[in-house]
Amino acid sequence: MAVTACQGLGFVVSLIGIAGIIAATCMDQWSTQDLYNNPVTAVFNYQGLWRSCVRESSGFTECRGYFTLLGLPAMLQAVRALMIVGIVLGAIGLLVSIFALKCIRIGSMEDSAKANMTLTSGIMFIVSGLCAIAGVSVFANMLVTNFWMSTANMYTGMGGMVQTVQTRYTFGAALFVGWVAGGLTLIGGVMMCIACRGLAPEETNYKAVSYHASGHSVAYKPGGFKASTGFGSNTKNKKIYDGGARTEDEVQSYPSKHDYV
């Protein structure tokens, strides 16, 4: 029961984390104009991984995509790559972990297979979380470095935009979303790895029992067997769960509304 709870909770935490990583990657507020020393501008600048935006006090907001790949700073490209790798690994991890969930039965999948899948998804979540944390941290470091270097007509690390004297950038909301989401994905991954240990069936070693036959004294020492394998003559020890037979036509996957974003 505790294993199922740990696995289920790990899955949910990772799901929230990956959703957060996706949200952070798409957000425009990775860096926002620093207003601490300059609250008097009627224009607010903020930038994301994919575009930069300007919000005027009149309410008009204009966003421009970075329509160049080669012209962008290597660090920005690296952050993009880390976030995308994190999302891809996380998505695969989620897919694998769905099938690994103890509460979900797929055919006659063995517990050992579920344990392996749980471990695999756990490792994927850990790497995914680390990618997100690394990506956000690299960007944050880039901001700190550029903060004191924002001088007139200087190209900063934020998408190669020309900065005027008064425009400095500080941490945007996306950085905090990314850090929290990466942390959650990491925690979820650790929980999945812990759950994996509980899922992996331990070898049951039966104590030797002496059978005294007439004329011979033969000791039978049955070797330890995996309770879940169902191999050999010990199948009577294993409960077989029949999930119900289904034809191929019955097992359909319906597209969700999120398949066509």
């Epitope: 501008t41 009627a42 930069s52 935006c53 300007v54 005027e56 009149s58 008009f60 020309v162 008064q166």
Partner: antibody, heavy 118, light 113 residues
Framework: EVQLQQSGAELVRPGTSVKVSCKAS????????IEWVKQRPGQGLEWIGM????????HYNEKFKVKATLTADKSSSTAYMQLSSLTSDDSAVYFC???????????WGQGTLVTVSA | DILLTQSPLSLTVTAGEKVTMSCKSS????????????LTWYQQKPGQPPKLLTY???TRESGVPVRFTGSGSGTDFTLTISSVQAEDLAVYYC?????????FGGGTKLEIK
């Protein structure tokens, strides 16, 4: 065409207060800022402040923070500016305008002449 | 506050002539985020409210005749009327839309001979 209709001319005593109205029509009132501008006879333009009719948020020119109070009534699509403790320096034409691109003032009311005289 | 200095204070021209007027800002009005200059030009005819001509220094407002052209960047801006018409008799103001409080230039009075 966007319209901003301001209240009529006011003749007021020094030390009293006056409330100028600006009724907006033919656009979504809550989607645009309303700005207020002062113009003394034969003089240039001075920005008083702005109000976001949607949220009620305001931003004032420090010079007019004590003098002017900006409000808006969403139900009647009307913005108001109250001027208090009036002196002869406050005698001017007051314009309301709708905010536009580039923090410009795209549409203007016809102006309200406020005369402070004993 | 940002000081906008307009010159000349007044100018008298004949119809059909080309006119240029200047507006100098005490600080750069260029925003690095979108590389736009937050300077606006208005025309105010006698007894009327001001009318928007250009915003972002050079973007002409819809309905404004093409003879009006705004230009410049940073601190130096110009409004050009390619061929002055009689109806262009007015005072022209520039406005800072980048820093609070918004400020206006003193105006350039255009008179027709």
């Amino acid at each position: 065409e966007v319209q901003l209709q301001q209240s009529g001319a006011e003749l007021v005593r020094p030390g009293t207060s006056v409330k100028v109205s600006c009724k907006a029509s033919r656009y979504a009132f809550t989607n645009y800022l309303i700005e207020w501008v002062k113009q003394r006879p034969g003089q240039g333009l001075e920005w008083i402040g702005m109000i976001n009719p949607g949220s009620g948020g305001t931003h004032y020119n420090e010079k007019f923070k004590v003098k002017a109070t900006l409000t808006a009534d969403k139900s009647s699509s009307t913005a108001y500016m109250q001027l208090s403790s009036l002196t002869s320096d406050d005698s001017a034409v007051y314009f309301c305008a709708r905010g536009g691109f580039g923090n410009s003032f795209a549409y203007w009311g016809q102006g309200t002449l406020v005369t402070v005289s004993a | 506050d940002i000081l906008l200095t307009q010159s000349p204070l007044s100018l008298t021209v004949t119809a059909g002539e080309k006119v240029t007027m200047s507006c100098k800002s005490s600080q750069s009005l260029l925003n690095g985020g979108n590389l736009k200059n937050y300077l606006t030009w208005y025309q105010q005819k006698p007894g009327q409210p001001p009318k928007l001509l250009t915003y972002w220094a050079s973007t002409r407002e819809s309905g404004v005749p093409v003879r009006f052209t705004g230009s410049g960047s940073g601190t130096d801006f110009t409004l050009t009327i390619s061929s002055v018409q009689a109806e262009d008799l007015a005072v022209y103001y520039c406005q800072n839309g980048y820093f609070y409080p918004y400020t206006f230039g003193g105006g350039t009075k255009l008179e027709i001979k």
